[in-house]
Interface confidence: low
């Protein structure tokens, strides 16, 4: 190889060894037969030289620092070339390194030709291999502003009083050309401006200059993202820390053309900005820190831009002003994320401040609007408590339980509303009753319905679920003794379609002490499945619930039991099933953890059936299936 | 009305040049990207650059790069497309687009023939 | 750069069938998907953009999905006014933009 550097090219190249690889034979630079394992070349030099392995790329490295001096003459702008170039060097992994120095007064533009940079952080690299380094000057310290990879979207990088540039390549890579010009700027007044040019949908993550280490005190560091009219932006910090500030404060300014507040002021630990149409400028200020303690001010952030669907030109007004106790969360449906780039799904309040997810509470109206490349990414759940603190002013009193029309509006699917309805102990029991008769939903017979109501006891102690429950059945009504929640679950989009078959009311009511009572009223064409509160787990120690069966003056009704024993184990007192006829009140007892169930049997009068549990052996719990089957009577036994 | 309006085509011999123009009416062509695309004979779409004024982003398709300049004069909403070093493989009607939900609005074209 | 690699290249119809066409994008674009419909000697009309969503003024019967880098056009009732070339374009991030070979639709 012959390496020849002409005088005046400020250009010094050192091969020298690199990262040290366990390799059984070591290889040297051979200069004039003299061994040596680094070689400096200077301008004005001309040296030969070979390698005495086959791979010396294994075992040195070049560098070739160019030295441009803006200070006391012309600064060389423009297309910065390979000197020397490529092919005139050996095949090593090679850094190329540009220093400019100049002037405070003037500003260096680095720009970047199309595949533009993306920045990395620590511990990422880059597919090719091929990396540039960036750093800046404050006086004599030097300040790295970023290592970047191809295929990004930084287009320009503003510096003042100098720029250090590297260019990693490696040594099996073809590049022949810089891919960046510099050209000088009027002073910028701050330590760099990053240009980000997106072109379409994407994202690009970006950190402050020394990222991870601390930025510069008081120093200012200022972002330009030129984002195409259609296009929405948000703004999300994936890390930051702040320093001890002695005097000034620590913050983010978004310079958002059009807006009458520029610039918008941001602690770093805001909710950043999003939704944003056009281009816009972000920039993080430094404080005077403390002089003993100073901490690290570092940030971390992503752009994500990406196109708005219709909704998100929209405003949604959601009136939650006549509500009370009642609170609405739109998040994200849990998903398997992929690995590829999904574009962002935010919900916005008064269009600006974007999150993942939004919780809006009663007492006023709120302004949404979405981002988001596809709005089944969300749902919404609500809570709603409806509690009653006098139980002589709640007596008899009824409350809807009905998803408000304003709901409907918004498009996005309701996931949970719950009703959280609460009573005073021991004072008032509740009543729930449905528009429409129910059906509980069980193996043997699934709810299809687009909707189910879960009921579940809404005591913390208390681990009592009565079971899932959709129009189409034959439940009338259901009392609960204390308090409980009512869940309406959707299952299909087409709930909206069916949103007039929901609605339940529920009443405060006398106290009674059983956990639960079922009104059934069969339906002729159809068995009524039933079970236990609670199943596959078992019905809760010391817990009774009854099941009220009307029979039709015309049918007799079948009891089936789905197992022949229960298979409870007592570890103290008995589990007992009582069926009682209700006009003659005569009534049979069986022993659930003694006896077998009963056999199918025939009741033409409406009838109880009651449960008792006992206090189990665990593993060896209380669960019960039976149906009732109506049959017309074929001879009048009354 | 939102109207693009090109010009500037016409019958050129190899290695010829032409500028295009495209005039636009409704809008503020530096708030949006402006294309270029072309469609030769009997054959489909390709684009060929596009521009935002705005920020003096240019961009352009592989066959075209080094040949043709994008630019835009802002005073007169007209976008232009230099076309240099011109090929046979050029021959093609020029549409110019501005871009918004997609590529919005279309100019009514204009025909370039390279050919000796 | 992203090959939209579209199909059919040419379909015959009736009036009323239901029409698919298919694209399919050679890495991850995203929605970033737009449909065209052009007729001899006329401009592209822009039918779908981002991948799914109707272009104001364009009828109900044309719509748009993604499955991944899959894109389809639909016509529901291919009417008379139909019967034109079809093309699919992306343009997602800072990669050129690049439109699909089109499909031609004609009367059977």
């Known amino acids: 190889f012959e390496i020849a550097l002409p005088r005046e090219s400020n250009i010094t190249v050192l091969i020298k060894l690199g990262t040290p690889t366990l390799l059984a034979k070591p290889c040297y630079i051979v200069i004039s037969k003299r061994h040596t394992t680094m070689l400096s070349i200077k301008p004005g030099e001309r040296i030969l030289f070979t390698f005495s392995c086959q791979s010396p790329e294994n075992h040195f490295v070049i560098e070739i620092q160019k030295n441009i001096d803006c200070m006391s003459g012309p600064c060389p702008f423009g297309e910065v070339q390979l000197q020397p170039s490529t092919s005139l060097l050996p095949t090593l992994n090679r850094t190329f390194i540009w220093d400019v120095k100049a002037h405070k007064s003037i500003g260096l533009e680095l720009q970047f030709s199309i595949p533009r940079l993306r920045q990395f952080g620590p511990g990422e690299s880059c597919p090719d291999g091929v990396t540039y380094s960036i750093s800046g000057r404050i006086d004599a310290t030097v300040v790295r502003i970023g290592t970047f990879c191809s295929n990004g979207t930084v287009s320009r990088i503003k510096m003042q009083e100098g720029v250090k540039m590297a260019l990693h390549l490696p040594w099996f890579h073809p590049r022949n050309v810089s891919g960046f010009s510099i050209a000088n700027r009027s002073s910028i007044k701050r330590l760099c401006i990053i240009e980000s040019v997106f072109e379409g949908e994407g994202s690009a993550t970006l950190m402050s200059a020394n990222y991870p280490e601390g930025f510069p005190e008081d120093e200012l560091m200022t972002w330009q993202f030129v984002i195409p009219a259609h296009l929405r932006a948000s703004v999300s910090f994936l890390n930051f820390n702040l320093s001890n500030c002695e005097r000034k404060e620590e913050r983010v300014e978004y310079y958002i053309p059009g807006s009458t507040t520029n610039p918008e002021v941001f602690k770093l630990e805001d909710k950043q900005p999003g939704n944003m149409a056009g281009n816009f400028n972000l920039s993080l200020q430094g404080c005077d820190q403390d002089a003993q303690n100073p901490g690290i001010l570092r940030l971390q952030f992503q752009v994500l831009v990406q196109h708005p669907q219709n909704e998100s030109n929209k405003i949604y007004v959601v009136d939650l002003s006549n509500e009370r106790a009642t609170s609405l969360t739109i998040e994200p449906r849990p998903v398997k994320q992929s690995r590829k780039f999904v574009p962002g799904c935010f919900v916005c309040l008064e269009s600006r401040t974007c999150s993942t997810n939004l919780t809006l509470t009663s007492g006023s109206k709120h302004k949404i609007s979405f981002l988001c490349d596809n709005l089944t990414r969300l749902w919404m759940n609500v809570e709603k408590n409806i509690s009653c603190t006098d139980h002589r002013y709640c007596q008899r009193k009824s409350y809807s339980l009905q998803v408000p029309s304003d709901i409907f509006h918004l498009p996005v699917e309701l996931h949970d509303f719950s009703w959280k309805l609460l009573v005073p102990k021991d004072r008032l029991s509740l009543v729930l009753v449905p528009a429409q008769k129910l059906q509980q939903h069980t193996h043997e017979k699934p709810c299809n319905t687009s909707f189910s109501y879960l009921v579940a006891s809404a005591i913390p102690s208390q681990d009592l679920y009565f079971g899932s429950f959709c129009p189409g059945g034959s439940i009338e009504q259901i009392q609960v003794k204390q308090n409980i929640s009512v869940t309406l679950r959707t299952f299909a989009p087409s709930f909206r379609q069916e949103a007039s078959r929901q609605g339940l009311t529920v009443s405060f009511i006398p106290y009674f002490k059983e956990e639960g009572v079922f009104t059934v009223t069969p339906d002729t064409k159809s068995k009524v499945y039933l079970r236990t509160p609670n199943w596959d787990r078992g019905l809760p120690s010391l817990t009774s619930v009854s099941w009220n069966i009307s029979v039709p003056r015309d049918q007799v009704a079948c009891l089936t039991f789905f197992k022949e024993r229960t298979g409870v184990v007592c570890q103290t007192g008995r589990a007992f099933m009582i069926i009682q006829e209700q006009r003659t009140r005569a009534e049979e007892i069986f022993s659930l953890d003694e006896d077998a169930l009963p056999k199918p049997r025939f009741h033409h009068h409406s009838f109880w059936v009651n449960i008792s549990n006992c206090s189990p052996a665990s593993g060896k719990q209380l669960d019960l299936l039976f149906w009732v089957t109506l049959t017309p009577r074929t001879v009048d036994l009354t | 009305e939102v109207q693009l309006v090109e010009s500037g085509g016409g019958l050129v011999q190899p290695g010829g040049s032409l500028r295009l123009s495209c005039a636009a009416s409704?809008?503020?062509?530096?708030?949006?990207?402006i294309h270029w695309v072309r469609q030769a004979p009997g054959k489909g779409l390709e684009w060929v650059a596009s521009i935002y004024s705005s920020s003096s982003y240019t961009s352009y398709a592989d066959s075209v790069k080094g040949r043709f300049t994008i630019s835009a004069d802002t005073s007169k909403n007209t976008a232009y497309l230099q076309m240099n070093s011109l090929r046979a493989e050029d021959t093609a009607v020029y549409y110019c687009?501005?871009?918004?939900?997609?590529?919005?609005?279309w100019g009514q074209g204009t025909l370039v023939t390279v050919s000796s | 750069d992203i090959q939209m690699t579209q199909s059919p290249s040419s379909l015959s119809a009736s009036v009323g069938d239901r029409v698919t066409i298919t694209c399919r994008a050679s890495q991850s674009v995203s929605s970033a998907v737009a449909w065209y419909q052009q007729k001899p000697g006329k401009a592209p009309k822009l039918l779908i953009y981002s991948a799914s969503s109707l272009y104001s003024g364009v009828p109900s019967r044309f719509s748009g999905s993604r499955s991944g880098t899959d894109f389809t056009l639909t016509i529901s009732s291919l009417q008379p006014e139909d019967f034109a070339t079809y093309y699919c374009q992306q343009s997602y991030y800072y990669y050129p933009i690049t439109f699909g070979q089109g499909t031609k639709v004609e009367i059977k």
């Open positions: 687009a501005r871009a918004y939900y997609g590529f919005d609005y």
């Open positions: 409704g809008f503020n062509l530096s708030y949006y990207y």
